[in-house]
C-alpha cells in the first residue's frame, strides 16, 4: 500500500482543515488508514482523523481544530496500521479556503432597488471577519446568457442594485462567495442560491434603453 498523491490540505481558518490524497489502488480509507495531526506547540495533543473515501483510491479527512493563529504549523502522519506511509506538515494560514457566506436574502420592498444581504461566515474574534470581500453572482433562470458577477470589495455584506439593471417580469437567482486578500485565499464555495421574481414599473420612455453591463468572472 502506497500513497500515489500526497495529502494536500486547506483550512477554513476557524475550526476545520480538509486534507485529500490518493492511494495507489482501491482503499477502504476508514478501516485501513489513520491521519494523525498535532499542533507544534506546548501542551498540544496528537489527534486522530478517520478518513472517508473520496472515489475509489481517494481519501479525505476533516481535521478539527479549536482555534487558529497565523503562525500555526501542524505535523501530519499518515498510517496504515503500524506502517507510516507519509509524513508532512501543514500551515493553515498558507492554505485558506474561507467558509461560504450564509443567509443570502433579496429584499425587494425598496422601490426600484434590490438589496441583497448575507451573513459573514466568521465570528468577530476571527481575523477573517474583517478581511472578507465577496462576489455576488446573479443569473436568469430563463436566459443562460443573462449571467453577471458583482464584486463587493467593501466589508459590509450587502449589495444594492437598481432593479432596472435586470429584466422585469422574470425570475432570477443569486448566490455569493467570499475570499480574503490578506491570506491570498482561494474563493469559498458558493452560498446556497436564493430566487426572486424581478418586477418593477419602468417609465415608458426609458423602455429598452438601458445599457446592461455583464461582468464575467
Amino acid at each position: 500500500m502506497k500513497v500515489l498523491q500526497e495529502p494536500t490540505c486547506v483550512s477554513d481558518y476557524m475550526s476545520i482543515s480538509t486534507c485529500e490524497w490518493k492511494m495507489n489502488g482501491p482503499t477502504n480509507c476508514s478501516t485501513e488508514l489513520r491521519l494523525l495531526y498535532q499542533l507544534v506547540f506546548l501542551l498540544s495533543e496528537a489527534h486522530t482523523c478517520i478518513p472517508e473515501n473520496n472515489g475509489g483510491a481517494g481519501c479525505v479527512c476533516h481535521l478539527l481544530m479549536d482555534d487558529v493563529v497565523s503562525a500555526d504549523n501542524y505535523t501530519l502522519d499518515l498510517w496504515a496500521g503500524q506502517q507510516l506511509l507519509w509524513k508532512g506538515s501543514f500551515k493553515p494560514s498558507e492554505h485558506v479556503k474561507p467558509r461560504a457566506p450564509g443567509n443570502l436574502t433579496v429584499h425587494t420592498n425598496v422601490s426600484d432597488t434590490l438589496l441583497l444581504t448575507w451573513s459573514n461566515p466568521y465570528p468577530p474574534d476571527n481575523y477573517l471577519y474583517n478581511h472578507l470581500t465577496y462576489a455576488v453572482n446573479i443569473w436568469s433562470e430563463n436566459d443562460p446568457a443573462d449571467f453577471r458577477i458583482y464584486n463587493v470589495t467593501y466589508l459590509e455584506p450587502s449589495l444594492r442594485i437598481a432593479a432596472s439593471t435586470l429584466k422585469s417580469g422574470i425570475s432570477y437567482r443569486a448566490r455569493v462567495r467570499a475570499w480574503a486578500q490578506c491570506y491570498n485565499t482561494t474563493w469559498s464555495e458558493w452560498s446556497p442560491s436564493t430566487k426572486w421574481h424581478n418586477s418593477y414599473r419602468e417609465p415608458f420612455e426609458q423602455h429598452h434603453h438601458h445599457h446592461h453591463h455583464h461582468h464575467h468572472h
Epitope: 476557524m14 475550526s15 476545520i16 507544534v40 506547540f41 506546548l42 501542551l43 479549536d66 482555534d67 493563529v69 497565523s70 503562525a71 500555526d72 466568521y122 465570528p123 468577530p124 474574534d125 481575523y127 474583517n130 490578506c182
Partner: antibody, heavy 116, light 112 residues
Framework: EVQLVQSGAEVKKPGATVKISCKAS????????MHWVKQAPGKGLEWVGR????????IYASKFQGRATITADTSSNTAYMELSSLRSEDTAVYHC?????????WGQGTLVTVSS | DIVMTQTPLSLSVTPGQPASISCRSS???????????LEWYLQKPGQSPQLLIY???NRFSGVPDRFSGSGSGTDFTLKISRVEAEDVGVYYC?????????FGQGTKLEIK
C-alpha cells in the same frame, strides 16, 4: 519553563497613560493569542482584550475600546497593554495571559494605582 | 454581552465533603465551530488564577481527578468530590465562545 513576566507596579495620576509589559519565555508568543485581564482590588476577573501577535489583530471588550491598546513585539517575545485617560476605577491588577485555546499561562500581574 | 452568573457566591465546606458550584450563561455559549468554550479557574489567595477545566468537562494537566465539570447549553457545574485544604480560593467560570469573553463573578470556597 514557561513563564510570563510582567513589568512592575505603577502609580499614575488621573488622566495619565500607563503601558505595562509581559515578556514570555519558554514559548513563542506568535503561537498564541495574548490576552489581558483586569482584577480590581477585592473584585473578580474582567476580560480586557487580546491580540494575535503575528498579524496584530486585536479585539477589546467594549468598556475598554478606545482607551486600551494591546500591542506585541514578536522579536522580543513581549506583549504590551497601554491604558489611557486613567481614572480611579482603573486601579487594579492587570494580568497578561496566553490562550491556546484556554488560559493555561498567567503572568504574575501588574498593580496599577491611579491616585491624585 | 453574555453574563455568567455563579451560585453560590460563597461556600464553606468540611474537608472530605463534596462541593458544587453552578454557572449559568445568559445565552448559549456554543461557538460557531460547534465547541463550547466553558472553563473553570481557581485563584488561590495571593496567586494568579490557574486553569482547572476546559471545554466543559476536560481536566487540565496536573489537576486532581476530584475536580470534574459538566453541563451543556447554558447550565454548567463544577464539582469537587472531596474538598481538601488546598482547594481554598475563588473559583471563576469563563466563557471563551463569544466576544466579549466573560467571567462569572466568582465563588469563594472556605474550609470549615
Amino acid at each position: 519553563e514557561v513563564q510570563l513576566v510582567q513589568s512592575g507596579a505603577e502609580v499614575k495620576k488621573p488622566g495619565a497613560t500607563v503601558k505595562i509589559s509581559c515578556k514570555a519565555s519558554g514559548f513563542n508568543i506568535k503561537d498564541t493569542y495574548m490576552h489581558w485581564v483586569k482584577q480590581a482590588p477585592g473584585k473578580g476577573l474582567e476580560w480586557v482584550g487580546r491580540i494575535d501577535p503575528t498579524n496584530g489583530y486585536t479585539i477589546y471588550a467594549s468598556k475598554f475600546q478606545g482607551r486600551a491598546t494591546i500591542t506585541a513585539d514578536t522579536s522580543s517575545n513581549t506583549a504590551y497593554m497601554e491604558l489611557s485617560s486613567l481614572r480611579s476605577e482603573d486601579t487594579a491588577v492587570y494580568h497578561c495571559v496566553s490562550r491556546r485555546p484556554w488560559f493555561a499561562y498567567w503572568g504574575q500581574g501588574t498593580l496599577v494605582t491611579v491616585s491624585s | 454581552d453574555i453574563v455568567m452568573t455563579q451560585t453560590p457566591l460563597s461556600l464553606s465546606v468540611t474537608p472530605g465533603q463534596p462541593a458544587s458550584i453552578s454557572c449559568r450563561s445568559s445565552q448559549s455559549i456554543v461557538h460557531s465551530n460547534g465547541n463550547t468554550y466553558l472553563e473553570w479557574y481557581l485563584q488561590k489567595p495571593g496567586q494568579s488564577p490557574q486553569l482547572l477545566i476546559y471545554k466543559v468537562t476536560n481536566r487540565f494537566s496536573g489537576v486532581p481527578d476530584r475536580f470534574s465539570g459538566s453541563g451543556s447549553g447554558t447550565d454548567f457545574t463544577l464539582k469537587i468530590s472531596r474538598v481538601e485544604a488546598e482547594d481554598v480560593g475563588v473559583y471563576y467560570c469563563f466563557q471563551g465562545s463569544h466576544v466579549p469573553y466573560t467571567f462569572g463573578q466568582g465563588t469563594k470556597l472556605e474550609i470549615k
